[in-house]
């Protein structure tokens, strides 16, 4: 798609333009820039206005359109999302006087849930102040191609539809897209419609496969045993639904009297041995399952379990 | 036989509660989300609430926010609806029906259950 | 929220005659309008999907047409158990869901 920014597990900038003004645009991929990766493997989107030093201010405006746009070096165009009605876009004369700073930040993570049912973003607000003086609400437009029909690659007017996002809980909106089984490995073109003290904020037009973004629940049953050997075996099962293998993270701690010890392993088997272990210790261990062969997004880390060891270990058992 | 059947509609003074029941079977109760739509006597049909398939995601209709609560058991294939705080306007059939996923459309209903909330 | 508005309210007609009903939705909705045949005691049924899709089971004489923000069903020749109230129903603004108010329609 050229009208469509493609999602990826990186983090974007959203930056978000009035008229009249000069404007740095900039895309951070993970790795380029300092704090750019998410510790649960998610990609972040970032919504950031930034303004040349000109004096452009949003408390100085009193009607202002806001467009925002990811960017990129190669492609400096924007694709915004049509609105349904009469194919206008999203962008709207609003008044701006609400805002005291130009700071009004995004995270939006999204991810195509383990049961293979429902794609989920969660738009979260970065700036706090703004959003607890004034309710904002989030609509997620979306459209899937037609059963029906041979849908052409770019949507047509008006073909959308909306979901409204739940925006209840913690300064943070869930939207859930339905996901028909049929349709999973076809294109979701979305776009996201920010609206707070009467300013609207439109996201690009963006597109996903949600079969390549499958966040798997996380692994069931992890449990901890002394083998024959002597060494420690960490099992799990596979969490149910997932269509293709999975690849496993598996973090643990060793805490003795003596050394504290830490470790990340990836593997894809369902199970984990760990040797060199100390008599009377504590291990502590969570494990997390992300799509072994193609792209997909690691489950949410499983619940820790500890497990101590005797101070004594005999070989064989007794 | 593929059928969604309603229970627990009855007489009840305003301010007092009322739990709905929905059986189902015949299909795959735990693929599929639920909606409970209500009809007052002689108007048109009104969505209530909606509870998706795994039963994390409930969503209200403005005036039964708070009040009512949609809750659903996949291993006893049912679907409840507790209404608290009962007002008059609340008086209506209950239909509990089926959503189809692709398209949004409910294409399964029960013959509903009458509540009627008066003093 | 989407309002959808039917018309007519009511109407009157005959077996073998052909019945248009119009919906109109107060914001353009694609084709996710479905279509419900209800009668009196009875639970509603399903007609028309994604506003011209037919349900199964339902007779070919119920047609729907449309997009945006106008639509139509149609029964091309009126049979006694057609006699009902009919009600369309917007599925573009999700999750909740609105119906349009009803047409009656009556022998005459």
């Known amino acids: 798609f050229n009208l469509s920014y493609p999602i990826t597990p990186w983090r974007f900038k959203l930056s978000c333009m009035p008229p009249n003004s000069t404007y740095d645009y900039f895309l951070l991929p993970a790795g380029l820039s300092k704090n750019t990766s998410n510790s649960n493997g998610h990609y972040e989107t970032a919504v950031e206005p930034k303004f040349n030093s000109s004096g452009t201010h949003f408390s100085n405006l009193s009607k202002t359109t806001f467009h925002c746009c990811f960017r990129s070096e190669q492609d400096r165009n924007c694709s915004l999302c049509a609105d349904n009605i009469e194919g206008k876009t999203f962008v709207s004369t609003v008044n701006s006087l609400v805002f005291q700073q130009i700071d009004a930040n995004w995270n939006i993570q999204c991810w195509l849930k383990g049961d293979l049912k429902l794609f989920i973003c969660y738009v979260e607000s970065l700036f706090k102040n703004l959003f607890r003086n004034y309710n904002y609400k989030v609509h997620l437009l979306y459209v899937l191609p037609e059963v029906l029909e041979d849908s052409p690659l770019v949507p047509q007017k008006g073909s959308f539809q909306m979901v409204h996002c739940n925006c209840s809980v913690h300064e943070c909106c869930e939207c859930l897209v339905p996901v028909p089984t049929a349709k999973l490995n076809d294109t979701l073109l979305m776009c996201l419609k920010i609206t707070s003290g009467g300013v609207i904020f439109q996201s690009p037009l963006m597109s996903v496969q949600p079969i390549n973004m499958v966040k798997p629940d996380p692994p069931l049953g992890l449990h901890m045993e002394i083998t024959d050997d002597g060494n420690l075996k960490i099992s799990w099962s596979s969490p149910p639904l997932v269509p293709f293998p999975l690849q496993y993270q598996v973090k643990y701690s060793e805490n003795s009297t003596t050394v504290i010890r830490e470790a990340d392993k990836i593997v894809s088997a369902t199970s984990l041995l760990v040797d060199s272990i100390l008599p009377g210790s504590s291990y502590e261990v969570q494990v997390r399952g992300k799509r072994l062969d193609g792209p997909g997004i690691w489950s949410d880390w499983s619940t820790p379990r500890v497990f101590t060891t005797q101070d004594v270990i005999y070989f064989p058992p007794k | 036989q593929v059928q969604l059947v309603e229970s627990g509609g009855g007489v009840v003074q305003p301010g007092k509660s009322l739990r709905l029941s929905c059986v189902a079977s015949?299909?795959?109760?735990?693929?599929?989300?639920m909606y409970w739509v209500r009809q007052a006597p002689g108007k048109g049909l009104e969505w209530v609430a909606v509870?998706?398939?795994?039963?994390?995601?409930?969503y209200y209709e403005d005036s039964v926010k708070g009040r009512f609560t949609i809750s659903r058991d996949n291993s006893q294939n049912t679907l409840d609806l507790q209404m608290n705080s009962l007002r008059v306007d609340d008086t209506a059939v209950y239909f509990c029906?089926?959503?189809?996923?692709?398209?949004?459309?409910?294409?399964?209903w029960g013959r509903g259950t009458l509540v009627t909330v008066s003093s | 929220d989407i309002q959808m508005t039917q018309s007519p309210s009511s109407l009157s007609a005959s077996v073998g005659d052909r019945v248009t009903i119009t919906c109109r939705a107060s914001?353009?909705?694609?084709?996710?309008l479905n279509w419900y045949q209800q009668k009196p005691g009875k639970a509603p049924k399903l007609l028309i999907y994604?506003?011209?899709s037919l349900q199964s089971g339902v007779p070919s004489r119920f047609s729907g047409s449309g997009s945006g923000t106008d639509f139509t069903l149609t029964i091309s020749s009126l049979q006694p158990e057609d006699f009902a109230t009919y009600y369309c129903?917007?599925?573009?603004?999700?999750?909740?869901?609105?119906f349009g108010q009803g047409t009656r329609l009556e022998i005459k």
């Open positions: 994604a506003a011209s």
């Open positions: 129903q917007q599925s573009y603004s999700t999750p909740p869901i609105t």
């Open positions: 015949g299909f795959t109760f735990s693929s599929d989300a």
């Open positions: 509870i998706y398939y795994d039963g994390n995601y409930q």
């Open positions: 029906a089926r959503l189809n996923w692709d398209y949004w459309y409910l294409d399964l």
């Open positions: 914001q353009s909705i694609s084709s996710y």
